[in-house]
Amino acid sequence: ELCDDDPPEIPHATFKAMAYKEGTMLNCECKRGFRRIKSGSLYMLCTGNSSHSSWDNQCQCTSSATRNTTKQVTPQPEEQKERKTTEMQSPMQPVDQASLPGHCREPPPWENEATERIYHFVVGQMVYYQCVQGYRALHRGPAESVCKMTHGKTRWTQPQLICTGEMETSQFPGEEKPQASPEGRPESETSCLVTTTDFQIQTEMAATMETSIFTTEYQ
């Protein structure tokens, strides 16, 4: 099951998955001025069997102004620091989730990828939180969140982390230096519509769409 929404927002903190469960989707987003190559993948999917998991596609971007395809290369350091989701493959992780069966590692960067990676997580995914640069962590419990399925609905557990404004930074488990501080993602809306589907199962629609129309006549 895909999780209905993003992990919770914690003021002055960012989250990171150490590994991605099978079924996780990563959108092939390109930075401004670039787009997916023609016939390029729309997303990458963590897929595999009990012994090995990997991302089933590669994302590729090309300039919006040209039709030339780009190569799959590692960004230069100045490009890499733009990326909001930095790779954290430290051997000091408390549990090396990436080596667990049914998990994929962080996909390598692709040229001209968007500055923020958009993942769609599955039930059972765990993410870890750290305070951004300039803030210190006060732990009341685990600084992590897990996507759980309860009564047919998905929800993320609330991480027990407060980031206070002291010039000291906390770190992800096993990380030696704090990463550059990305700004938080837009806050999620929380309105829900409870509905009975045609399949006669009571479910919570965590998302709704509503269309309306404007017409104009050319003079």
Epitope: L2, D5, S41, A114, R185, S188
Partner: antibody, heavy 102, light 107 residues
Framework: PGSSVKVSCKAS????????ISWVRQAPGQGLEWMGW????????NYAQKLQGRVTMTTDTSTSTAYMELRGLRSDDTAVYYC????????WGQGTTVTVSS | DIRLTQSPSSVASSVGDSVTVTCRAS??????LAWYLQKPGQAPKLLIF???RLHTGVPSRFSGSGSGTDFTLIINSLQPEDFGTYYC?????????FGQGTKVEIK
Amino acid sequence: PGSSVKVSCKASGYTFTSYGISWVRQAPGQGLEWMGWISAYNGNTNYAQKLQGRVTMTTDTSTSTAYMELRGLRSDDTAVYYCARDFRMDVWGQGTTVTVSS
Amino acid sequence: DIRLTQSPSSVASSVGDSVTVTCRASQDIKRRLAWYLQKPGQAPKLLIFDASRLHTGVPSRFSGSGSGTDFTLIINSLQPEDFGTYYCQQANTFPQTFGQGTKVEIK
């Protein structure tokens, strides 16, 4: 015919910028036709070839609303127009009927 | 563009029957295929994505399989609410494309 229409699609209950918006239409008694997709994250678009030049998709992240404008309307543009969440299209709008008549 | 061909175009079945719908892609789309059910006057509803993953709230009598170019949707023990038109759709590359639909009617 010749006029334009702008259909809006207001999303709620999820992080708007984490997903794109797909637009699909359905002519009376016909199947589903993909019109295009827009990234709510960065505004990148991809349009169906046959609509290129007539269609424009935009988003307003401040109101979590997507828009689809179709210009130079013809009678064969008569259809129900749907928006749906991202390319997986797991959540759909109720549809907006556009009738092009002379 | 990737073409999707569904078969049969229509089928008449009774409640309790098992129904199989197939979808063939004109080129390899890995497992990036979704199935939707649309009832008259309603928007389509996602049933299955990534060829076999059941969308939230969809009963387990629906199942999907296949990869590459050949895909199958099976509905076991058809229920009254399952009647309508089923569409397959590829989400591998743009432009996204739909099959022409399979109408499942009451016999």
